[in-house]
């Protein structure tokens, strides 16, 4: 069998085929193709079950899609001499069901980060942070892309799904220069509380295909870069007052709130003031009532208080079975 | 009772230009979204476009984008689709219908023919 | 962009008889709407929501499931049950998509 040598311009990829030698330092590993030029090793759709040992120092971009890998260990890509130009990695779809504390240790320049598509039932709370110190180095991550790595509900853990996510983003605030974070199609009920206030850098956060029903206590006061805010495809029947005034008082903030189950009752008189006068909703005029019946299909834009209405509260005494 | 009134039949030459009207009552005109759809003899519904009366804001279907033109007149409570370069193609019943997550009240249909 | 498949495209049923169509959609949507279209009629919303009946509907009909598969059902066929059936997904923002529908026929 022939042995895949650095690849050279004039062949962008090169397909590894297995070396009977101890591999050099820029060779390819078997079943991966890899490409010098562009500092791309890709090692797609090849049922791996582990991450190859012989990955090149000069990889910047590292595709591992589509693989079987199951369990990403710690120092999972700790290499000597570290792998120190590694900085996009794509794990998307390889079937891993638990990353381990400090798997992704030893990678000085990570930083875009992409799981989705793995049903992830167990996430350590130092997947990012590498250690379990209250106060951890930096992660070097910008870009962490989460998306639909919620797991069938017969592997879940018995502690909450979100709060086991929330635990890894928060660890060691490590994720501070984080400003990219992508957590759509997870089943989220809720966000928890504290996420946020330690994600200050963020400017694109996606939680679209929840299952969110309110913000009423998720504080985004201190995202004060935050320019897109994803919350299409949700379960909102109403954002209050307190969301609302923080939202507005976002400098750059676009907010994207598309496919919601809006309840025009009495309790949306303050969101249908505030879309008429924000410019900070993209596409506010598509936003519909979803509840009570006689509401349904009406632009939210085009109400008024007289159309907000609650069915009084009768008191139990007035109340029939 | 909320109603959307259509012409029965339109019959136009081919490369010609037509404008389908839809005229709606029993409702607050500016509160939905007028939405519109085009069904061809013994085939599916196609949705082609949608407008907001209240700012005149469109959607189309890419497959409409250059064909299409919806408008409202507020002050007559009518949605108006033209329709360009009329080929055979086009020979299809065209629904008017208010909606937002679904299409609640629906025109009874324009039969447009278009042949030489 | 969902795409949404009904089966079977045609289907015929004896008054009295249980009928199921199914709408199978290419991506996981929240509801599925269903419209009844008589020959020569306008479609008229029959299902909403994936379970709930428009005003006037009879009770034999009821709607079922979630993620990416929907079904209809008529508990007892009746002659006037015969029509096309079309299911859209549930959105509010644009494109909208039907189904390619089923034709019932009373056999």
């Known amino acids: 069998t022939s042995s895949a040598s650095s690849s050279s311009s004039s062949a962008p990829f090169l397909a590894s085929a297995a070396s009977a030698q101890p591999p050099l330092p820029d060779q390819c590993p078997a079943l991966c193709e890899c490409s010098e030029a562009a500092r791309t090793v890709k090692c797609v759709n090849r049922n791996l079950t582990e991450v190859p040992t012989d990955l090149p120092l000069y990889v910047r971009n590292l595709f591992l899609t589509g693989n079987q890998l199951a369990v990403l260990p710690a120092g999972a890509f700790a290499r000597r001499p570290p792998l120190a130009e590694l900085a996009a990695l794509n794990l998307s779809g390889s079937r891993l069901d638990e990353v381990r504390g400090g798997a992704f240790e030893h990678l000085p320049s990570l930083r875009q980060l992409d799981l989705s598509h793995n049903p992830l039932a167990y996430l350590s709370p130092f997947a990012f942070s590498g250690s379990n110190a209250s106060i951890s180095a930096p992660s070097p991550l910008v870009e962490l892309i989460l998306n639909h790595i919620v797991p069938p509900d017969d592997k879940r853990q018995n502690r909450s799904f979100e709060g086991m996510v929330a635990a890894a983003l928060v660890a060691g605030r490590a994720l501070q220069g984080l400003h990219l974070l992508e957590l759509a199609s997870n089943h989220f009920l809720y966000l928890p509380r504290d996420v946020l206030a330690q994600l200050p850098s963020l400017r694109y956060l996606d939680l679209s295909n929840n299952s969110l029903v309110s913000l009423t206590y998720v504080s985004f006061r201190n995202l004060t870069h935050l320019e897109s805010l994803h919350l299409e495809d949700n379960a909102l029947k109403v954002l209050h007052n307190g969301t609302l005034a923080e939202l507005q008082g976002l400098p750059h903030v676009r907010v994207f709130l598309d496919n919601n189950p809006w309840v025009c009752d009495c309790h949306m008189a303050d969101m249908v003031t505030w879309l008429k006068q924000t410019g900070v909703v993209q596409g506010k005029d598509r936003l519909t009532c979803a509840f009570p019946e006689k509401m349904r299909n009406r632009v939210l834009l085009e109400l008024n208080s007289a159309d907000l209405d609650c069915d009084p509260i009768l008191p139990p005494s007035l109340q029939t079975s | 009772q909320v109603q959307l009134q259509q012409p029965g039949t339109e019959l136009v030459k081919p490369g010609a230009s037509v404008k389908l009207s839809c005229k709606a009552s029993?409702?607050?005109?500016?509160?939905?979204?007028m939405h519109w759809v085009k069904q061809r003899p013994e085939q599916g519904l196609e949705w082609i476009g949608n407008?907001?009366?209240?700012?005149?804001?469109?959607n189309y279907n890419e497959n409409f984008k250059s064909q299409a033109t919806l408008t409202v007149d507020k002050s007559s409570s009518t949605a108006y689709m033209q329709l360009s370069s009329l080929t055979s193609e086009d020979s299809a019943v065209y629904y008017c219908a208010r909606g937002g997550w679904d299409f609640d009240y629906w025109g009874q249909g324009t039969t447009l023919t278009v042949s030489s | 962009q969902v795409v949404l498949t009904q089966s079977p495209a045609i289907m015929s049923a004896s008054p009295g008889e249980k009928v199921t169509m199914t709408c199978s959609a290419s991506?996981?949507?929240?509801?599925i709407h269903w419209y009844q279209q008589r020959s020569g009629t306008s479609p008229k919303r029959w299902i909403y929501?994936?379970?709930k009946l428009t005003s006037g509907v009879p009770v034999r009909f009821s709607g079922s499931g979630s993620g990416t598969s929907y079904s209809l059902t008529i508990s007892s066929m009746e002659a006037e049950d015969a029509a096309t059936y079309y299911c859209q997904q549930w959105t509010s923002k644009p494109p909208w998509t039907f189904g390619g529908g089923t034709k019932l026929e009373i056999r």
């Open positions: 029993g409702y607050t005109f500016t509160s939905y979204w």
């Open positions: 991506s996981s949507v929240r509801y």
């Open positions: 407008i907001n009366p209240s700012n005149g804001n469109t």
């Open positions: 929501d994936t379970s």
